[in-house]
C-alpha cells in the first residue's frame, strides 16, 4: 500500500530536485501543528505569528489581543499562562533547560486590569515550576526544591515545605528518575478541581547513588555534574504524597496520604495522581517489581482534616505475563458520579481496551474489544467517551478518534476521523475544550499535517486551523521518496514494516538497505505519519532503501508481542530485525552486500547487538548513545522489563545481554559508535565500556564523542552528527561523495 504516492509526472521530472542534507539540517520542510490553548468551552488562546496572545471565541467568531507582543518582548517572554479568572498572565523568560521535561525560568506577573506588571512580593528566580490554580488566581510555585503558595499574585508567599535540598529532597518536582521514567512531567504537584487543595509529591533521594560526569565548559577545570540516579538494583527514591488546604494552609499543614498496605510492604513507586472532586483524589502506586499496580481512591475527612483511603476503594491491576500497563500504567478517567471510571488495561485476550469500573476491577465492564488496541481516552462527558485506537483497517500504526455514546444503551460507536481525509490523514490526536463543546483534530500524516476545529456535538468541521500550505508549495518541486507500510508473517509473528524507497525506485534493480531501529519495549516505529528527515534524504538523494520494523516487544498489537521480551531484553528485538532483513533480501531488490543498521538509544543497543549477531548480514552500522548493559541504566525503566540484577532474580540475563559480551563479533563489521559526554540519561559510561571491550578484543572500530552534549545531541552537534553518519554510510555503501 503506497501511502505517499509520488506526484511526479515524467514531463515535470527535469524541474524536480532531490532532498539535500542541508534541507534536513535547516529544517526546510518542517511542519506546523495548531493546539488551541483552551480557556473555556468555546474560547481558546493562541500565539499569533507576530507573537501577540490572541483570544478566540468560536461562537461569536470574534478575536482580540489580550497581551501584546510589546509586553511579551519587554521581559523577553517565550511563554505565558492566563489565570483562570483572566485577571493576570504569567510571562516566562530566561528558559534554562535541565533534563527532558524540566527547566527553570524567570516569571513576571502581568495585571490585565491595569496593564502593569505586579510590583511588590515579586517571584524569586529562577523558579523550577509555576502554575495557576484551576479557579481564580492563586499561584503555586517551586523554588529551590520547596513549594510556595500565593493567594493572589501580589501577596507575600506562604511557604508550604521547608525540607527541600538540592539533589536530596524534591518537593513538587520530580527527581531525575521520576521525571524521565515515571511521571514524564517537570512537575509533581496537582491542584484540586476548584483549587481548594494542592497535592504534591516529596522525593527523598538521600540514599541514592550518584552518577558523576565531567562538564568541560570553557573553564580551566571541568565542572562535575552530580545526579542522584538509581541504576538497576540500586536504592530508589522514597516518595510521599501530601495534600494541603490552600485556603487555610497554615493551621493543619500538609497531610500525608496513606500508601496502600499491600504496596507499602516492600519497595514501591507512586505513578500518578488524579483529582476526582475537591474532596476526592485518586492515587496510583506500583510495586518495585512492576507487575502489580494499585489504584487508591481517597476521601477528605473534614473533622480530622485528613485523607482516608479505604481498602474497599483500592483497585488492583496485575499482569501475569509481563509488567503492569504498557509503557506506563494507564490513568483513570472518572465519570460524573465521581466514583466510577474508565481505564485502559489488558482484556482476557491480551489486548489493551477501555473498561468501565464501578465497584471492583473483577466486575469491570469492557467497553471496547477486538484484536487491536485502545490507546488513549481523551474525554468523558455525560453522554460521550472520546478515545483513540488503531482499529481502522487493521493498521497498528494508525490512530483514529472515536466517540462512544455512553448516554444511550446499547452504547454506539462512531469513528470521527476515519473518513475525513482518508489518504492524507490516518494518524490523529485531539484536544478538547471544556465539556467537549469543541475540539481540535491534529493530523500527523501520512500526508502533510493539518489541524482542524470541530463541533463537539455534531463533529462538523468548523475551520482549518493550520494546513501547512507553505510546506505543500515548497515540496512541489521535491522528489520525495515513496513510503509503504506492509507486514511480514513469520512463525506466527506479524512484523509490520515501513519501507522508504528512492523516488525512481525500480524493483528490478539492487539498492543498498539501511535498517533504522528503535525497538524498545512498548515503542512503535512503523507509524502512518509525515516526515521529511535524514532517512528521507538518504532515499531521495543517495538512493538507499530504508526500512523500519516493529518486532517483538513493540506496542499496540497485543500483549503476546509486547510482553515477549519480558525479562529477556536484547534477544527477540534483534532476532526480528534480522528476520526482516532476510525477508527483504528475498524481495529481490536489496543488494545483500550493502546492508547497514543504525539506531539511537535503545536503537543503538539493538543495532550493536544486530551487528554483533554473527549473521554476516550487515556490512556496517551505527550506534548513537547506546545502552550497553542494563546494569548501567535507570532502575525504573530497566527493572520494569528485566526484573532485578540479583542472583535469585535475573542477573544471568543482565550479564548475557551486554554489548561488551559480544565484542569479538564486531571484527567483521564496520562499527561507528557515537555518544555525548554529558548524557544524563544513557551515560557515556555505556559507550566507554563498549570501546574498552573492543580495544581489549583488538577489534577496530570508529567512534565520535560530542563534548558536553546530552542524549539529544542538539544544536551544532546535530549537523555534525548527521554529516558524519552520512559520510560513514556512503563510504560503507561505496557511494560517491
Amino acid at each position: 500500500i503506497v501511502l505517499r504516492p509520488s506526484r511526479v509526472h515524467n514531463s515535470e521530472e527535469n524541474t524536480m530536485r532531490a532532498l539535500t542534507l542541508k534541507d534536513i539540517l535547516n529544517g526546510t520542510f518542517s511542519y506546523k501543528t495548531f493546539f488551541p490553548n483552551w480557556i473555556s468551552g468555546q474560547e481558546y488562546l493562541h500565539q499569533s505569528a507576530d507573537n501577540n496572545i490572541v483570544l478566540y471565541n468560536i461562537e461569536t467568531g470574534q478575536s482580540y489581543t489580550i497581551l501584546s507582543n510589546r509586553t511579551m518582548k519587554s521581559v523577553n517572554a517565550s511563554n505565558y499562562g492566563l489565570s483562570p479568572d483572566r485577571q493576570f498572565v504569567y510571562l516566562e523568560s530566561d528558559y534554562s533547560k535541565l533534563w527532558r521535561y524540566s527547566y527553570t525560568a524567570t516569571y513576571y506577573i502581568y495585571d490585565l486590569s491595569n496593564g502593569e506588571f505586579v510590583r511588590g512580593n515579586e517571584l524569586p528566580r529562577p523558579i523550577q515550576y509555576l502554575c495557576w490554580s484551576p479557579v481564580g488566581s492563586k499561584l503555586a510555585y517551586v523554588y529551590q526544591n520547596n513549594i510556595y503558595l500565593k493567594q493572589r499574585p501580589g501577596d507575600p508567599p506562604f511557604q508550604i515545605t521547608f525540607n527541600g535540598r538540592e539533589n536530596k529532597i524534591f518537593n513538587g518536582i520530580p527527581d531525575w528518575v521520576y521525571e524521565e521514567e515515571m511521571l514524564a512531567t517537570k512537575y509533581a504537584l496537582w491542584w484540586s478541581p476548584n483549587g481548594k487543595f494542592l497535592a504534591y509529591a516529596e522525593f527523598n533521594d538521600t540514599d541514592i547513588p550518584v552518577i558523576a560526569y565531567s562538564y568541560y565548559g570553557d573553564e580551566q577545570y571541568p565542572r562535575t555534574i552530580n545526579i542522584p540516579y538509581p541504576k538497576a538494583g540500586a536504592k530508589n527514591p522514597v516518595v510521599r504524597i501530601f495534600i494541603i488546604d490552600t485556603t487555610y494552609p497554615a493551621y493543619v499543614g500538609p497531610q500525608e496520604v496513606p500508601v496502600p498496605a499491600m504496596i507499602a510492604s516492600s519497595d514501591y513507586y507512586f505513578s500518578w495522581l488524579t483529582w476526582v472532586t475537591d474532596e476526592r483524589v485518586c492515587l496510583q502506586w506500583l510495586k518495585r517489581v512492576q507487575n502489580v499496580s494499585v489504584l487508591s481512591i481517597c476521601d477528605f475527612r473534614e473533622d480530622w482534616q485528613t485523607w482516608d483511603c479505604p481498602k474497599t476503594q483500592e483497585h488492583i491491576e496485575e499482569s501475569r505475563t509481563g509488567w503492569a500497563g504498557g509503557f506506563f500504567v494507564s490513568t483513570p478517567v472518572f465519570s460524573y458520579d465521581a466514583i466510577s471510571y474508565y481505564k485502559i488495561f489488558s482484556d482476557k485476550d491480551g489486548y489493551k481496551h477501555i473498561h468501565y469500573i464501578k465497584d471492583t476491577v473483577e466486575n469491570a465492564i469492557q467497553i471496547t474489544s477486538g484484536k487491536w488496541e485502545a490507546i488513549n481516552i481523551f474525554r468523558v462527558t455525560q453522554d460521550s467517551l472520546f478515545y483513540s485506537s488503531n482499529e481502522f483497517e487493521e493498521y497498528p500504526g494508525r490512530r483514529n478518534i472515536y466517540r462512544i455514546s455512553i448516554g444511550s444503551y446499547p452504547p454506539s460507536k462512531k469513528c470521527v476521523t476515519c473518513h475525513l481525509r482518508k489518504e492524507r490523514c490516518q494518524y490523529y490526536t485531539a484536544s478538547f475544550s471544556d465539556y467537549a463543546k469543541y475540539y481540535a483534530l491534529v493530523c500527523y500524516g501520512p500526508g502533510i499535517p493539518i489541524s482542524t476545529l470541530h463541533d463537539g456535538r455534531t463533529d462538523q468541521e468548523i475551520k482549518i486551523l493550520e494546513e501547512n500550505k507553505e510546506l505543500e508549495n515548497a515540496l512541489k518541486n521535491i522528489q520525495l521518496p515513496k513510503e509503504e507500510i506492509k507486514k511480514l508473517e513469520v512463525d506466527e509473528i506479524t512484523l509490520w514494516y515501513k519501507m522508504i524507497l528512492p523516488p525512481q525506485f525500480d524493483r528490478s534493480k539492487k539498492y543498498p538497505l539501511l535498517i533504522q531501529v528503535y525497538g524498545g519495549p512498548c515503542s512503535q516505529s512503523v507509524r502512518s505519519v509525515f516526515a521529511v528527515n535524514w532517512i528521507s534524504y538518504l532515499a531521495s538523494k543517495e538512493g538507499m532503501v530504508i526500512a523500519l520494523v516493529d518486532g517483538r516487544g513493540t506496542a499496540f498489537q497485543g500483549d503476546k508481542l509486547l510482553y515477549a521480551v519480558y525479562r529477556k531484553l536484547g534477544v527477540y528485538e534483534v532476532e526480528d530485525q534480522i528476520t526482516a532483513v532476510r525477508k527483504f533480501i528475498e524481495m529481490g531488490f536489496i543488494d545483500e552486500k550493502r546492508i547497514a543498521i543504525w539506531g539511537w538509544s535503545y536503537g543503538g543497543y539493538v543495532s550493536s547487538l544486530a551487528l554483533a549477531s554473527g549473521t554476516g548480514l550487515f556490512k556496517c552500522g551505527i550506534a548513537v548513545a547506546p545502552v550497553s548493559s542494563w546494569e548501567y541504566y535507570a532502575s525504573v525503566y530497566t527493572e520494569r522489563f528485566m526484573g532485578l540484577p540479583t542472583k535469585d532474580d535475573n542477573l544471568e540475563h543482565y550479564k548475557n545481554s551486554t554489548v561488551m559480551a559480544r565484542a569479538e563479533y564486531f571484527r567483521n563489521v564496520d562499527y561507528l559508535l557515537i555518544h555525548g559526554t554529558a548524557d544524563d540519561n544513557v551515560h557515556f559510561q555505556n559507550s566507554a565500556q563498549i570501546a574498552k571491550a573492543l580495544v581489549n578484543a583488538q577489534v577496530d572500530f570508529q567512534a565520535m564523542w560530542y563534548s558536553d552534549q546530552n542524549h539529544g545531541l542538539s544544536g551544532l552537534s546535530t549537523n555534525h552528527l548527521y554529516t558524519h553518519m552520512t559520510h560513514f554510510l556512503k563510504q560503507c555503501f561505496s557511494l560517491s561523495d
Epitope: F158, F162, T247, A250, Y251, G253, W304
Partner: antibody, heavy 122, light 107 residues
Framework: QLQLQESGPGLVKPSETLSLTCTVS??????????WGWIRQPPGKGLEWIGS???????YYNPSLKSRVTISVDTSKNHFSLKLSSVTAADTAVYYC??????????????WGQGTLVTVSS | DIQMTQSPSSLSASVGDRVTITCRAS??????LNWYQQKPGKAPKLLIY???SLQSGVPSRFSGSGSGTDFTLTISSLQPEDFATYYC?????????FGQGTKVEIK
C-alpha cells in the same frame, strides 16, 4: 505584653450550654499569624484541645466534641467565645484560652489565659 | 487521632540532675512537636516548639530533639523551679493532642 482573660459562669447545670469568652488585650486578634484556641483540663488530668478559630471565622474543632462545640470571634471587641452544649459532669474542667502561632509552622500555644474552672452540677 | 505517649509518667530527681523525658507519637508528625511546663494552679507555659526550638525567655538548660515519631525533652541541670508537670503536644494534625504528662518531683 499580650494578655488573655477567660470570663463566664463557673457553674453550669447538666444539659445546658457552657459559654465562655476570652478577651485579648495588648495585641490584635485580627492577625494572619495566629489562631485562637480553647483547651481544657479536668481536675487532676491532662490537657485536651477543644478547638481554634481564625480572625476570619475559620474554625477547627476536636472531632470528639465537634457536635457540641461552637467557637466564634468578634474582631471589633477583640474577643473570641466558646459554647459547649449539652454538658455533663465529664465537662467539668479548667478552661484555658490561648494564642496559637501558625506561621512559621507548626502551631504552638505561646500565650495562655490563667484559666477558669467550670463545674457542671445541678 | 494521633496518640501521644510520654514516659515516664513521673520521675524523682535531684537539683543538678540531667533529666530526660520522651514522647512518642502513634504516627509520624515530622518536627511538629511542642513541650510545655505546668505548675499546680497555673496555665501551661511553652518551652520548646518545632521539636527543638527554644521559646524566647526559656533557660538554655531546656532542649528538645527528635523528629518523626520519637522526641525527647532534656533538662541538662535540674533547678528547683523546674519541678512541675511536662506535656508534649503535636500540631501536625487535627485534633491537636497532648501527652498524658510527666510529673518531675523532688527526690
Amino acid at each position: 505584653q499580650l494578655q488573655l482573660q477567660e470570663s463566664g459562669p463557673g457553674l453550669v447545670k447538666p444539659s445546658e450550654t457552657l459559654s465562655l469568652t476570652c478577651t485579648v488585650s495588648g495585641g490584635s486578634i485580627s492577625s494572619s499569624t495566629y489562631y485562637w484556641g480553647w483547651i481544657r483540663q479536668p481536675p487532676g488530668k491532662g490537657l485536651e484541645w477543644i478547638g481554634s478559630i481564625f480572625y476570619s471565622g475559620n474554625t477547627y474543632y476536636n472531632p470528639s466534641l465537634k457536635s457540641r462545640v461552637t467557637i466564634s470571634v468578634d474582631t471589633s471587641k477583640n474577643h473570641f467565645s466558646l459554647k459547649l452544649s449539652s454538658v455533663t459532669a465529664a465537662d467539668t474542667a479548667v478552661y484555658y484560652c490561648a494564642r496559637e502561632i501558625i506561621e512559621p509552622r507548626p502551631g504552638y500555644f505561646d500565650y495562655w489565659g490563667q484559666g477558669t474552672l467550670v463545674t457542671v452540677s445541678s | 487521632d494521633i496518640q501521644m505517649t510520654q514516659s515516664p509518667s513521673s520521675l524523682s530527681a535531684s537539683v543538678g540532675d540531667r533529666v530526660t523525658i520522651t514522647c512518642r507519637a502513634s504516627q509520624s508528625i515530622s518536627k511538629y512537636l511542642n513541650w510545655y511546663q505546668q505548675k499546680p494552679g497555673k496555665a501551661p507555659k511553652l518551652l520548646i516548639y518545632a521539636a527543638s526550638s527554644l521559646q524566647s525567655g526559656v533557660p538554655s538548660r531546656f532542649s528538645g530533639s527528635g523528629s518523626g515519631t520519637d522526641f525527647t525533652l532534656t533538662i541538662s541541670s535540674l533547678q528547683p523551679e523546674d519541678f512541675a508537670t511536662y506535656y508534649c503536644q503535636q500540631s501536625n494534625s487535627i485534633p491537636r493532642t497532648f501527652g498524658q504528662g510527666t510529673k518531675v518531683e523532688i527526690k
